[in-house]
């Protein structure tokens, strides 16, 4: 994994500047593991950044992701008049000017160095979970999700339909 | 429109049982985590229960002075969601709402208009 | 549990007068970098309806007036010119552990 130095020296200025027309409500620098917990760790390979699934040795340090929430409507056709309420949607970035980044034609999910405003690929509609966990839904997808699949993220198609365990879709943030 | 429309309640003996049903419509149902919320007479309100989704293994969670005494369930296909109630005391009497949370599970934002049990001898 | 603790118990202000409620919850209600907290109104004979969630974040259709503010375990909720609809009791209610658990309320009538 490599150093995320960069990440601890992000300012609110930085943040504060528009990124989808509208500043961040708030934003959280955490570790992203899995249900599991294994850690989520970003390594640079041939200029570009891969994402791995792995268990982490003993004191070894976790990658940090800056989290940056922000409100949005959610794009429900059920309700034109608002009242499936909004919602909480956040982008993941865990090195200066990469985000995390749905691809939803290769259902893969990648890390990508963006323009702002960010494209609606880098943002995920956060869904709160029990056993402290939360999930991160693809804004330009609904119903496919991020999760772990042969140690790599990927995107994932979950049908609330369908009786499937859901704990690869599953993470935990942490501060530490 | 989205509604949620409680039945079921009315009057009670203590230790008497009840089921109360809530019928939802305007929204796909399967998508939306659901809790019971009651208010007694003159009083605050109280959180009661919640289920999750089939994908959730339709997991359940109850306030500690129900557990044991009141369960949660739905039935997708129809579009409803039930409370049974077993060993009722005069403490459950209470406006008793169905709510759902909104889509991501951040807060109730649907809410019905309530049923009355009345637990009394 | 955490207990959600609310004050004042009832409140009576101006019509166009700002009007403050404050929510103190018995442990921090904070997790993932936002606050498990949210605000809902309640009018007589009516459920209550969402103001505020994740302690400042105003729901879908809620007038401007109604803000929110605190993190960990001090909240509040702010009226800033009070309207005559707005006669009502408030709750405070936390959402990151179960069971959710809602403050006594806060009658706020007009003077």
């Known amino acids: 994994a490599f150093g995320i130095s960069g990440v601890q020296k992000y300012t609110r200025a930085l943040h504060d500047s528009s990124i989808t027309g509208i500043s961040p409500i708030t934003e959280y620098l955490a570790s992203l593991s899995t249900y599991n917990d294994q850690s989520i760790t970003f390594a640079l390979e041939d200029e570009s950044y891969e994402i791995y699934v792995e268990d982490l040795k003993k004191d070894e340090k976790k990658d940090k992701v800056l989290l940056s929430y922000y409100e949005s409507q959610h794009p429900s056709n059920e309700s034109g008049d608002g009242v499936d309420g909004k919602m909480l949607m956040v982008t993941l970035s865990p090195t200066k000017d990469f985000w995390l980044h749905a691809n939803n034609k290769e259902h893969s999910v990648e890390l990508h160095k963006c323009e702002k405003p960010l494209p609606d690929q880098a943002f995920f509609v956060l869904h709160n979970m029990h056993s402290n966990c939360v999930s991160f839904e693809c804004k330009t997808d609904p119903g496919v999700f991020i999760g772990v699949k042969d140690n790599h993220l990927a995107l994932i198609k979950v049908d609330s339909s369908e009786n499937l365990c859901t704990e690869n879709i599953l993470f935990k943030l942490s501060e530490t | 429109e989205v509604q949620l429309v409680e039945s079921g309640g009315g009057l009670v003996q203590p230790g008497g049982s009840l089921r109360l049903s809530c019928a939802a419509s305007?929204?796909?149902?399967?998508?939306?985590?659901m809790n019971w919320v009651r208010q007694a007479p003159g009083k605050g309100l109280e959180w009661m229960a919640e289920?999750?989704?089939?994908?959730?293994?339709?997991?359940?969670h109850y306030a500690e002075s129900v557990k044991g005494r009141f369960t949660i369930s739905r039935d997708n296909s129809k579009n409803t969601v039930y409370l049974q109630m077993n060993s009722l005391r005069a403490e459950d009497t209470a406006v008793y709402y169905c709510?759902?949370?909104?889509?991501?599970?951040?807060?109730?934002?649907?809410w019905g208009q309530g049923t009355l049990v009345t637990v009394s001898s | 549990d955490i207990v959600m603790t609310q004050s004042p118990d009832s409140l009576a202000v101006s019509l166009g007068e700002r009007a403050t409620i404050n929510c103190r919850a018995s442990?921090?209600?904070?997790?993932?970098?936002?606050?498990?907290l949210n605000w809902y109104q309640q009018k007589p004979g009516q459920p209550p309806k969402l103001l505020i969630f994740?302690?400042?974040s105003q729901g879908s259709g809620v007038p401007d007036r109604f803000s929110g503010s605190g993190s960990g375990t001090d909240f509040t909720l702010t009226i800033s010119s009070l309207q005559a609809e707005d006669v009502a009791v408030y709750y405070c209610?936390?959402?990151?552990?179960?069971?959710?658990?809602f403050g006594q309320g806060t009658k706020v009538e007009i003077k």
């Open positions: 994740v302690a400042s």
């Open positions: 289920i999750t989704l089939k994908f959730n293994n339709y997991s359940t």
């Open positions: 305007g929204f796909t149902f399967s998508n939306y985590w």
């Open positions: 442990e921090s209600v904070d997790k993932f970098g936002v606050s498990f």
């Open positions: 209610q936390q959402s990151k552990d179960i069971p959710y658990t």
């Open positions: 709510a759902r949370r909104n889509y991501g599970n951040w807060y109730i934002n649907v």
